[in-house]
Each structure stands twice: as C-alpha cells, then as structure tokens.
Interface confidence: low
C-alpha cells in the first residue's frame, strides 16, 4: 500500500490522543533505554510503511501484536485516513485469522513495540516536502 495520500495530521492526532498511550501501557515496566532503535524512517509515508509492517506482520519471536489495543487503533486510523487502505487489508486479515496464536508478551515483542514507538515519534516530526 502506498501511504502518500493519507491525511497525516489526522493520523498524528489519533497517535497523540490514544495510540501513544496504548504503546506506553504495553511497555509499562520496561526501561526506555532497554532497547536500541534499529528501525528508522525518513518521511511520513515511509514511517507508516514501517509502522504497518512492524504492527501487523508476524515476526520470529513475536506473532501476536495485531490483536493489541494499539494495533487495533492503528488499523482504524489507517482505514479512516488512508484512502483505499481497508481494501488492501482484507486478504491479510483473513490470512491472519487462520493462524491465531496464543497471546503472550515476549521480550521480542517488547523490543518490537519499542521500535514502533520510535517510528511513531519520527512520524510526528515536521515533514519536509519535496520542492
């Protein structure tokens, strides 16, 4: 999905009002310095691409993020403020339902959510437009 045409300010507002708090809740009890940020992004469409990948694509050691509160709110924000996003996610959602796993917070998941926090913060920086 190409995130270029999303309403970035509305997504930013959704992040600031709720998603950020849900990410903090998920990370509660973890020191902010515990994980190094290794995933990066440089503009808003790129940041959303990385955020979507880390939030919804199962990875080795962390398969359960998509059912977390912050993930559901992220999905809702993208569906509302990114034209055509919902349609691209139908097949992915159906595939995900077939292999639902037991919800467990692993250290790998905590590390992944720490990366997400960094990506979201980068998303919120003032955007430089191509001139």
């Amino acid at each position: 999905y190409d995130f270029t045409n999303c309403d970035f300010e509305k997504i930013k507002a959704a992040y600031l009002s709720t998603i950020s708090k849900d990410l903090i809740t998920y990370m509660s009890g973890t020191k902010s310095t515990e994980f190094n940020n290794t995933v990066s992004c440089s503009n808003r469409p790129h940041c959303l691409t990385e955020i979507q990948s880390l939030t919804f694509n199962p990875t080795a050691g962390c398969a359960s993020l998509a059912k977390e509160m912050f993930a559901m709110k992220t999905k809702a924000a993208l569906a509302i403020w990114c034209p055509g996003y919902s349609e691209t996610q139908i097949n992915a959602t159906q595939a995900m339902k077939k292999r639902r796993k037991r919800k467990v917070t692993t250290n790998k998941c905590l590390e992944q959510v720490s990366q997400l926090q960094g990506l979201w913060r980068r998303f919120n920086r003032p955007l430089l437009k191509q001139q």
Epitope: S40, S42, L128
Partner: antibody, heavy 121, light 105 residues
C-alpha cells in the same frame, strides 16, 4: 563512529557561487536530516536550511530562499550546500549538522568541522 | 517564524558561582536544545529537549522550562564552562538564539 567531513576553505569574488560538501559516515545517510548552519565572524549561529537525504525534501530559511540550494548524493553519502550571488556579508564558517531524534526532540547531534568561505573582491 | 531571545548577552562570573542563562521564544515551543561553543570550534550539543544532558556533559548543568521560557543553569562554574551557549528550537523552521557568552569575571 558518526563523522561529517566538509570540503576545504574557499575564497570567492562578490556575485560568484560557492558549493560546500559534507561527507557523512558511520550511520545510514538516508535515516536522518542534514542541516546547514553558518556563523559570520563574531556573530551568532544562523540556520540556513535542512534536507532529507531520503527524499530530497527541503526547507529553507526565508532569508536565503532563492540563493541557497541544498542537494544530496545518496550513493556518495554526501550533502551539498550551494550559495549564489555572494556578497561580503556571506563571509562565514559554514557547518553541516546531522539532525537525529533524541529525547523527544530533533537536535543537531553531530557537526562537521566547518568550511570557511571568504567573499572578497 | 519563531524568534529566540537569549539573555543576558554576556554573563561575567567567577569559577564556583552559579550561572543562569535564559532563552525566550516569541511563541510556544515543545522543547529547547542547548549547544556549547568555544572559540574556533564547532558547536557541541549540550542539552537535548529542555532537560536531557548530552553525553559527557557534567551533572552541574541542568535545563528547565516550557512554553516560551527556558533556562540553562550551571550550579558551580568550572574553568572549562566558560564559553558561548546557544538555544535552538525545531518546532517549525529551525532557529537559534543570539547566544550567551559566559566569561570569567
């Protein structure tokens, strides 16, 4: 180790242009913004502009708009600042400075050594 | 454009004294960064995002403030602290204050 190495000193005549380079190493060049800041002798720091090496997006200080052009060569991990229609008051040290995310703010955490540009007839 | 005004322009103090540097913004900003510069050198990041000391900065330095008013404080001046300090914001276009020179009295 992050390093920003700038090109050498330049002496230019009024009306000419100057192009200063800033070679980055020790990090992924496209991950962070690059600022350009200048400082005339005995004067304050003056922000000129910023570029995203990822997409070439730029933002300029209105004072320099139309005279300054920021570009990057991603393959060479190098940022460039070109200033045209030089005048004597452009005599200054020109710095490139990486801007990274840290502590909930975007700060200029690594600076080049500076390039002295002298404009004189 | 947000204008940053630093005061005083020059602060003449003796080693061991307390230094208070002020930076005022023409409109509210989220946070303020501070840089130290010594003659012939590039600026060095000193305090990130209002109150976080950069790597290697001694604990005698502290930063505080919010909105339009920010402060850098040096609890007890050491000889190596005498330098020029600049505040900087990055809320919209980036911008620096005019600097405060901390000199030996």
């Amino acid at each position: 180790e992050v390093q920003l190495v700038q090109s050498g000193a330049e002496v230019k005549k009024p009306g000419a242009s100057v192009k200063v380079s800033c070679k980055a190493s020790g990090y992924t060049f496209t991950d962070d913004y690059m600022n350009w800041v200048r400082q005339a002798p005995g004067q304050r720091l003056e922000w000129m502009g910023i570029i995203s090496p990822y997409n070439g997006g730029t933002s300029y200080n209105q004072k320099f708009k139309g005279r300054v052009t920021l570009t990057v060569d991603k393959s060479a991990s190098t940022a460039y600042m070109e200033l045209s229609s030089l005048r004597s008051e452009d005599t200054a040290v020109y710095y490139c400075a990486r801007e990274d995310y840290d502590y909930d703010g975007y700060a200029m955490d690594y600076w080049g050594q500076g390039t002295t540009v002298t404009v004189s007839s | 454009e947000i204008v940053l005004t630093q005061s005083p322009a020059t602060l003449s103090l003796s080693p061991g004294e307390r230094a208070t540097l002020s930076c005022r913004a023409s409109s509210s900003v989220s946070y303020m960064h501070w840089y130290q510069q010594k003659p012939g050198q590039a600026p060095r990041p000193w305090i990130y995002a209002t109150s976080n000391l950069a790597s290697g900065v001694p604990a005698r330095f502290s930063g505080s403030g919010s909105g339009t008013s920010y402060t850098l404080t040096i609890s007890r001046l050491e000889p190596e602290d005498f330098a020029v300090y600049y505040c900087q914001q990055s809320d919209n276009v980036r911008g620096f204050g005019g600097g405060t020179k901390v000199e030996i009295k």
